[in-house]
Every structure is written in structure tokens, then in C-alpha cells.
């Protein structure tokens, strides 16, 4: 788990409610699933389903759980030690360089190309030239052959935040 979980909001500032468990820091840090108190004397548990921390830390507030966008499915819920895992719905994918939204997979390859890779939650269909075997750039063609892709098969999640 990485320490800096990008684009995560902090949970709103909160005083420890009576139901939140407290324990003492170990060697000055608090364990996963907790944050440190302002005086550094206590570890306060994160709230299940609301916020989390993934590692030993001196965070003053736990990190807010991600909510899956429309067009995404929740692979695993947010716990006190792990953020929500969201994945693009079948037939859509999220590229590393544009992670903000799921995009529709192409339904087929351009003329003169054959499909060698299916639509997955993290990649579009893959097309190569029939002759040379070189990959297609990925731009949606003006004319498509009737080479259709099968729906994306669930595999490893495309956005693991936490």
C-alpha cells in the first residue's frame, strides 16, 4: 500500500466520538485503521465505511473512502484499512493516462486489422494490422469491420486507491 493516496479527500474534521476506539501510539505512530490525536497521545480508529488508513501513520484524520462513480462497479468495499476498489463496468475501460472516467470500448477493428485483445476494465480492444502485426493507435475508426469484441472480462481492478 502506498503512503500517498492521490486525490483522496480527508475525512471531515472530527472529535473522537465515544464509540471510536482509542489506543496508545506505538513508537509514536498509529496502526492501519487509525489516526493520531492532536496531542499525539492516542490512536483513534477510523470509521468503517467512511474513512480509512492503510499503514502506520501520524495522520491527524483518516482518509475519506472513495465512492465509485456511475459507470463503475464496486469490487470491494471500503474498510478501516483499505479504500474502496472500483472497476469500470463491462464494455468500458479506464486508461492510465486518463483515469478520471471509464470510456466505451470499441466494438471492432478498422479495415485491414484483426482483433488480438479483448476489452478489459483497464484496456480497449487491441487491434493489429493483418500483414505486419503492428498495433493500431487506438483511435476510433470512421469505418469498422464487423469484428466485434466480447465484453470485458473481470480481472484485476483498474483503480486500486489504497
Amino acid at each position: 500500500e502506498s503512503a500517498l493516496i492521490t486525490q483522496q479527500d480527508l475525512a471531515p474534521q472530527q472529535r473522537a466520538a465515544p464509540q471510536q476506539k482509542r489506543s496508545s501510539p506505538s513508537e509514536g505512530l498509529c496502526p492501519p485503521g487509525h489516526h493520531i490525536s492532536e496531542d499525539g497521545r492516542d490512536c483513534i480508529s477510523c470509521k468503517y465505511g467512511q474513512d480509512y488508513s492503510t499503514h502506520w501513520n501520524d495522520l491527524l484524520f483518516c482518509l475519506r473512502c472513495t465512492r465509485c462513480d456511475s459507470g463503475e462497479v464496486e469490487l470491494s468495499p471500503c474498510t478501516t484499512t483499505r479504500n474502496t476498489v472500483c472497476q469500470c463496468e463491462e464494455g468500458t475501460f479506464r486508461e492510465e493516462d486518463s483515469p478520471e472516467m471509464c470510456r466505451k470500448c470499441r466494438t471492432g477493428c478498422p479495415r485491414g486489422m484483426v482483433k488480438v485483445g479483448d476489452c478489459t476494465p483497464w484496456s480497449d480492444i487491441e487491434c493489429v494490422h493483418k500483414e505486419s502485426g503492428t498495433k493500431h493507435s487506438g483511435e476510433v475508426p470512421a469505418v469498422e469491420e464487423t469484428v466485434t469484441s466480447s465484453p470485458g472480462t473481470p480481472a484485476s481492478p483498474c483503480s486500486l486507491s489504497g
Partner: antibody, heavy 119, light 106 residues
Framework: EVMLVESGGGLVQPGGSLRLSCAAS????????MSWVRQAPGKGLEWVAT????????YYPDSVKGRFTISRDNAKNTLYLQMSSLRAEDTAVYYC????????????WGQGTLVTVSS | DIVMTQSPSSLSASVGDRVTITCKAS??????VAWYQQKPGKAPKLLIY???TRHTGVPDRFTGSGSGTDFTLTISSLQPEDFATYYC????????FGQGTKVEIK
């Protein structure tokens, strides 16, 4: 008087390794959470690593995770930063820093040691 | 991660001037903000923590204020030794710093 003195910086090639040290004095070293913070030439400050007072727990930002390792020897009052797979963007002055009592932030810093990653 | 936007990036002032530096957090950080002073080739020095608490030995001409996302460091009457670069830092979620404000002699 709290004193933190870094050493071990220098010129290293991309992909290379380097170990920085920070000698602490003037306080009970084993009681304090310690960190490394860096400052690239002409740039702002960036947190690099944190270690618990006893050395059992560490954490890092994504930018260095898996490449840098923070450690400490409380018997020698020394903090370390082992850096590997160094990149040009790791070029910076590296400071060791102490987390203060009941303030959850850095109260004392060393003078820094310059690490230059270049071929 | 939380971005701290500091302004101005530099300013020119004279001894005795009142100087104000601001820092804006990209999200609510409560009062978990510190201010540091750094002179060339020297270690940063803690001035203010918890947004408004002066560190030991810091002159009372340095005042910090703010909460949530907007923070200010004020030097009420600039002294010759105050010409330096000042950084804000949030420590609510890990540690991130502003880009610095260089206070120069006018």
C-alpha cells in the same frame, strides 16, 4: 541544544545507490519519530520518509516507495536513508528532521546534504 | 495529496514594514499548519505550529492565523534578520509544503 548533522551526499549516476546518515545529539533520539525531507534545486520542500521512534514502522510517499528505505540505530543516535534506483529527479538537498513533542510536525532540521544524480 | 498554494512567491520590503504571507490549502486541514523560515544554506527553522502557536524562542512579531483552508503569517515589524524564505506546511495528511515566499530587502 538539538543538533542534526547529515552526511553521505554526493554525485551518483542514474540507477545508482547512496546511503545518507544523520547524527543526532542534544536530545533523547530514541524517543522521537524522525523523517527525511528533500529540496530540489530552486524548488519547494518534499517529505520523503518517516520512521517510528523505535524503528519498527516506516512510511513513504509514492515518489520514493520501493526505492528508498529509512532506518535508524538508536544506540548510535543515527538516522539513515538508503536510496537506490536513483533518478535525475531525486537530485536535491536532503534534510533529516525531528517530529516535535505533541505537535505532530517537524520542530528541528539538519543543515542538509546535497545529492546529485547525473551521468 | 493536499496542495498548499503560497503567495506571493516573493516580495520586497523594508525594515520596520508589516509583511503578510498567505497560504491556501486545497482542502480543509483544520489548524494543522506550520510555518518555517529558511536562510540560504541553512536548516529550516520552525516558527509557528497549529496555525498560531509560536515555537520556543520565536519573537512575538511573528504571528500565525487561520483555519480550514486559509492561513496567514504576519511579521508585524520586519527586522534585518527576517530577510529569508518562508514556507507553510500542512501536516493533517502526511506532509506537504507551499512553494515558498522569498522576503527581500527593498
Amino acid at each position: 541544544e538539538v543538533m542534526l548533522v547529515e552526511s553521505g551526499g554526493g554525485l551518483v549516476q542514474p540507477g545508482g545507490s547512496l546511503r545518507l546518515s544523520c547524527a543526532a545529539s542534544g536530545f533523547t533520539f530514541s524517543s522521537y519519530v524522525m523523517s527525511w525531507v528533500r529540496q530540489a534545486p530552486g524548488k519547494g520542500l518534499e517529505w520523503v520518509a518517516t520512521i517510528s521512534s523505535g524503528g519498527s514502522y516506516t512510511y513513504y510517499p509514492d515518489s520514493v516507495k520501493g526505492r528508498f528505505t529509512i532506518s535508524r540505530d538508536n544506540a548510535k543516535n543515527t538516522l539513515y536513508l538508503q536510496m537506490s534506483s536513483l533518478r535525475a529527479e531525486d537530485t536535491a538537498v536532503y534534510y533529516c528532521a525531528r517530529r516535535g513533542d505533541s505537535m505532530i510536525t517537524t520542530d528541528y532540521w539538519g543543515q542538509g546534504t546535497l545529492v546529485t544524480v547525473s551521468s | 495529496d493536499i496542495v498548499m498554494t503560497q503567495s506571493p512567491s516573493s516580495l520586497s520590503a523594508s525594515v520596520g514594514d508589516r509583511v503578510t504571507i498567505t497560504c491556501k490549502a486545497s482542502q480543509d486541514v483544520g489548524t494543522a499548519v506550520a510555518w518555517y523560515q529558511q536562510k540560504p544554506g541553512k536548516a529550516p527553522k520552525l516558527l509557528i505550529y497549529w496555525a498560531s502557536t509560536r515555537h520556543t524562542g520565536v519573537p512575538d512579531r511573528f504571528t500565525g492565523s487561520g483555519s480550514g483552508t486559509d492561513f496567514t503569517l504576519t511579521i508585524s515589524s520586519l527586522q534585518p534578520e527576517d530577510f529569508a524564505t518562508y514556507y507553510c506546511q500542512q501536516y493533517s495528511s502526511y506532509r506537504t509544503f507551499g512553494q515558498g515566499t522569498k522576503v527581500e530587502i527593498k
